[in-house]
């Protein structure tokens, strides 16, 4: 039957929709089995994967999807909504111990680094030669940023500057890398995230580095100290163009909602952080940039700055996109989308 909605995460969706949210027709599952096995850990029930219907064979948190046969968009989600009255499946299972955000093996930190002043993962996204947004280098060819940073569909309008401290690149000539943008991959519906693919991989050196992603579905303790970085609006008349940092601390979603006078109900896909210093926080030009937290001496991007409800309003904590909620999607894109070789 032509089911028009799905329950939970759509793992059992058996409808006959065969078109993606981008308007592409789905390709036959049997043509893509090799790719599925190579890239995606999944629990195969071959009988479900008939024809080219939208399905969710890998338990994707964001619903049914399909392959497209289009090399630009190898797979995409389908335009099916959750059934009315059905609640979003929680990613945090309260029956189990809280998942740590840092990647650890038997309590030991993997790739942990001491806190340092290096912010080599910070990207300045340029639109028509001017800084428009921040971003985080999470892999040599991938920058995590926000969809509000892209007023044009012409990728020639953008470039990514890496290895800089000054928004104009003054004094950063030796360390600056300027890279073209080859693709924008928009996040799941309502996420406000974009994975921006670079035309060639960044060269990792003393000035350019990647930042870690948190574990999927992890929670970070309240009052954890974090930072936001950006070249955005500072309120200063003689802004020097240098990268700014604001120190924030993690606040639970309920408490955060109270600070917003109950006008805001936070979703599981959001994370909240309040300012240590009254009136500091992200603003225009900082969008797309990271909320960076440290756990077990490991720095991670836990949030992405998106346009919100005013800039740095006293006693109003900032609301960010919770990266841990989208970590599986990020990994799936990085695994399945082709990147240029260096």
């Amino acid at each position: 039957s032509g089911q028009d909605c799905y329950r939970g995460n759509g793992k059992n969706y058996m409808g006959q929709l065969s078109q993606t949210r981008s308007g592409l027709t789905c390709s036959m599952w049997d043509k893509n089995m090799e790719d599925l096995h190579r890239h995606i850990f999944w629990e195969p029930d071959a009988s479900k994967l008939n024809e080219n219907y939208c399905r969710n064979p890998d338990d994707d948190a964001h619903g049914p999807w399909c392959y497209t046969g289009n090399p630009l968009i190898p797979w995409d989600y389908c335009p099916i909504s959750r059934c009315e009255g059905d609640t979003t499946p929680g990613i945090v299972n309260l029956d189990h111990p809280v998942i740590s955000c840092a990647k650890t093996i038997e309590g030991r930190v993997v790739n942990g680094i001491p806190t340092r002043t290096n912010i080599g993962w910070m990207v300045s996204l340029r639109y028509r030669n001017k800084h428009i947004c921040g971003g985080s280098l999470i892999k040599e060819s991938w920058v995590l940023t926000a969809r509000q940073c892209f007023p044009s569909r012409d990728l020639k309008d953008y470039e990514a500057w890496l290895g800089i401290h000054d928004v104009h690149g003054r004094g950063d000539e030796k360390c600056k890398q300027v890279l073209q943008v080859s693709q924008l991959v928009y996040g799941p519906e309502g996420s406000d995230l974009v994975l921006m693919k670079l035309a060639r991989p960044a060269v990792l050196d003393d000035f350019v580095s990647t930042i870690d992603l948190p574990n999927y579905g992890c929670t970070i303790p309240e009052k954890t100290s974090c930072s936001v970085y950006g070249w955005g609006y500072t309120g200063l008349i003689n802004y020097d163009g240098l990268l700014r940092v604001a120190h924030l601390y993690i606040m639970g979603n309920e408490k955060c909602s109270q600070h917003h006078r109950g006008k805001v109900t936070l979703q599981e896909s959001e994370i909240c952080a309040g300012a240590e210093k009254i009136g500091s926080g992200p603003c225009e030009g900082d969008y797309g940039g990271p909320l960076v937290c440290e756990q077990h001496k490991m720095r991670m991007v836990l949030g992405v700055i998106v346009p919100g409800r005013g800039c740095a309003i006293p006693n109003r904590p900032g609301i960010f996109v919770r990266v841990a909620y989208y970590a599986k999607w990020i990994h799936k894109i990085i695994l399945t989308y082709k990147v240029p070789q260096s």
Epitope: G23, N70, I132, R147, F150, P151, R153, L184
Partner: antibody, heavy 120, light 112 residues
Framework: QGQLQQSGPELVKPGASVKISCKAS????????MNWVKQRPGKGLEWIGR????????NYNGKFKGKATLTADKSSSTAYMQLSSLTSEDSAVYFC?????????????WGAGTTVTVCS | DVVMTQTPLSLPVSLGDQASISCRSS???????????LHWYLQKPGQSPKLLIY???NRFSGVPDRFSGSGSGTDFTLKISRVEAEDLGVYFC?????????FGSGTKLEIK
């Protein structure tokens, strides 16, 4: 989701100019395109052009170049459209419309429309 | 400019019937990024148009599931599975793949 409040109806003489306004609320004004659409009585919709308030970028339909000028004031979250050298052909309802950025690029918030009547 | 041809111009239906509106573009609406920016709007008498379907087949929030969109390339269809009184008005298809953006001439859905 946002709202757009347009200025009131205008009655103008041929050859004159008119400037209509559109005040945005409930969303980040500088992070969406503002479009303008014309509708003549009983007729279809015609796209005039758009402005990106964050940067002041504009795109125009060739047919309206020289006729319409789009501006935006970020501080008051208001977009403006000036129509010049008016003729009876310019009598229409003009809508301001928010265009959601990618991956959507659709018109999701429409103003109520401003009626411009050109008569001698 | 991309010409959007909508048929029929007028569509008389009985309540509860299925309605189907066709929209054809003079060139492909597939953008170089792989997306197809073909949308459908409904304008009720005396009101502004409202978004129904975006990018061929995505229902906008709050739009009932009796509305569905399909198609690809240059040929697109809007279907209403069971017409209700509140569905009456003028339906426009629109493309935002190519500048200038263009609209179809509209299809008036009315009671038979």
């Amino acid at each position: 989701q946002g709202q757009l409040q347009q200025s009131g109806p205008e009655l103008v003489k041929p050859g004159a100019s008119v400037k209509i306004s559109c005040k945005a609320s409930g969303y980040v004004f500088s992070s969406s395109w503002m479009n303008w659409v014309k509708q003549r009585p009983g007729k279809g919709l015609e796209w005039i052009g758009r402005i990106y308030p964050g940067y002041g970028d504009t795109n125009y339909n060739g047919k309206f170049k020289g006729k319409a000028t789009l501006t935006a004031d970020k501080s008051s979250s208001t977009a403006y459209m000036q129509l010049s050298s008016l003729t009876s052909e310019d009598s229409a309802v003009y809508f301001c419309v928010r265009e959601e950025l990618g991956p959507y690029w659709y018109f999701d918030v429409w103003g109520a429309g401003t009626t411009v009547t050109v008569c001698s | 400019d991309v010409v959007m041809t909508q048929t029929p111009l007028s569509l008389p239906v009985s309540l509860g019937d299925q309605a189907s509106i066709s929209c054809r573009s003079s060139q492909s609406l597939v953008h170089s990024n792989g997306n197809t920016y073909l949308h459908w709007y409904l304008q009720k008498p005396g009101q502004s148009p409202k978004l129904l379907i975006y990018k061929v087949s995505n229902r906008f929030s709050g739009v009932p599931d009796r509305f569905s969109g399909s198609g690809s390339g240059t040929d697109f269809t809007l279907k209403i599975s069971r017409v209700e009184a509140e569905d009456l008005g003028v339906y426009f298809c629109s493309q935002s793949t190519h500048v200038p953006y263009t609209f179809g001439s509209g299809t008036k859905l009315e009671i038979k």
